[in-house]
Interface confidence: low
């Protein structure tokens, strides 16, 4: 978890002088509670946005937006703490909006946005906005939380972000697998425009089971430049096991941008359909 660039972040708007600061996720008001605290945020919305860094890289970011309730507690609102928690790692990152001037009611509802938390493909986050100061112990909570799921690199917009492109998202191998005679599989896929090696991982299963009955790894050396974008054809020999007929073929590239952590592509071959054995027709029809 990180912030997009570390340039000056702004939260000021007409009628409010505000600065964005790093936060330890433990606001001082937890330790020194105040008597009067503001109410909770209203209508917290989290959306997936995309932002360019100063270097020109494109990253997915969490666009956080919320409004204030129209009550007198805005007179005691000193700022907000924005917290993003990555659920599978428990990593948390916070920033603090510090209001340098008092809020006043005006003809429009106050609205705040922040779009600088960089998020990772295929990850889930919990986003929390806490109004400051935080409530006294046993006081009414003045925060709002929402979960936010980031699509994986298959998503059309995500595919062209820097983290996805670094893991090989633009490569479409268009894998085809056909079963040949004599217990063989013919695997064909399109090479990418990089002189790097590939690995084909074959796992075979019985018809209705999930325990593998055969595994095989096939190494494909780095292609020459004239072979880029060409089809690579590989014939794999299967183990001659009756019923070991369902195959998963996975192709793992080793691009320089992602090394051994590149996106893999796979294709499956189902077991052949068994023809229904028809009921035997008797030679004669009984007359009774």
């Amino acid at each position: 978890l990180r912030l997009l660039d570390h340039r000056a972040l702004v939260c000021s708007q007409p009628g409010l002088n505000c600065t964005v600061k790093n936060s330890t996720c433990l606001d001082d008001s937890w330790i020194h509670p105040r008597n009067l605290t503001p109410s909770s945020p209203k209508d917290l919305q989290i959306q997936l946005h995309f932002a360019h860094t100063q270097q020109g890289d494109l990253f997915p970011v969490a666009h956080i937006e919320w409004t204030l309730q129209t009550d007198a507690s805005i007179l005691y609102l000193e700022g907000a703490e924005l917290s993003v928690l990555q659920l599978n790692t428990n990593e948390r990152l916070c920033v603090r909006f510090e209001f340098l001037s008092k809020l006043r009611h005006h003809h429009r509802r106050w609205r705040f946005t922040f779009s600088h938390f960089v998020v990772d493909p295929d990850q889930e986050y919990e986003v929390t906005v806490h109004h400051l100061p935080k409530p006294i112990p046993d006081g009414d909570p003045n925060h709002q939380s929402k979960n936010f799921l980031v699509p994986d690199c298959e998503h059309a917009r995500m595919k062209v972000t820097t983290p996805c492109m670094s893991s090989g998202s633009l490569w479409d191998p268009n894998i085809t697998v056909e079963t040949l005679e004599a217990h063989q599989l013919r695997v064909s896929f399109t090479l990418w425009n990089e002189s790097t090696h590939y690995q084909i991982l074959l796992t075979s299963f019985p018809h209705m089971e999930n325990h593998s009955c055969f595994e095989h790894m096939h190494h494909i050396p780095a292609p020459r430049p004239e072979e880029f974008h060409q089809r690579s054809n590989v014939t794999l020999t299967l183990r001659n096991l009756k019923g070991c007929c369902r195959h998963q073929v996975q192709i793992q590239p080793f691009f320089s941008s992602c090394l051994n952590d590149c996106l893999r592509h796979s294709a499956t071959v189902s077991c052949p359909e068994m023809p229904d054995t028809p009921e035997p027709i008797p030679d004669y029809m009984p007359l009774w």
């Epitope: 990850q123 796992t203 595994e215 051994n260």
Partner: nanobody, 126 residues
């Protein structure tokens, strides 16, 4: 790319216990499945225990009921608690990680891992 570093190996008498740790570091933007493998001299590397990113576990028949795999996502660490150790458990133990959330039935297949540690030696004497 993920780097893995095992620790906790050593020598122990049969019936004793050891706890192996595997610290993962490096940029990871995806979920990972992780496993412990072992390789005795002159033998093939075999899967011992695996866990996917949903926390589903899989054990080799030879260690079922004696070994326990767990992971601490906050610390990016994988553990293997080994109890009732036997001389046949003597081997070099390797930690492995693979990107994506793997089916539980493939967790002990070494072909589905793309990052490996250097290994830690476990010796069980009778």
């Amino acid at each position: 790319q993920v780097q893995l570093q095992e620790s906790g190996g050593g020598s122990v008498q049969a019936g004793g216990s050891l706890r192996l740790s595997c610290a993962a570091s490096g940029y990871t933007s995806k979920t990972y499945h992780m496993s412990w493998f072992r390789q005795a001299p002159g033998k093939e590397r075999e899967g011992v225990a695996g866990i996917n990113s949903d926390g589903v576990t899989k054990y080799a028949d030879s260690v079922q009921g004696r070994f326990t795999i767990s992971r601490d996502n906050a610390k990016n660490t994988l553990y293997l608690q080994m109890d009732s150790l036997r001389p046949e458990d003597t081997a070099m133990y390797y930690c492995a990680a693979g990107s994506g959330n793997m089916f539980d039935f493939l967790l002990l297949s070494r072909h589905h891992y793309n990052a490996w540690g250097q290994g830690t030696q476990v010796t069980v004497s009778s």
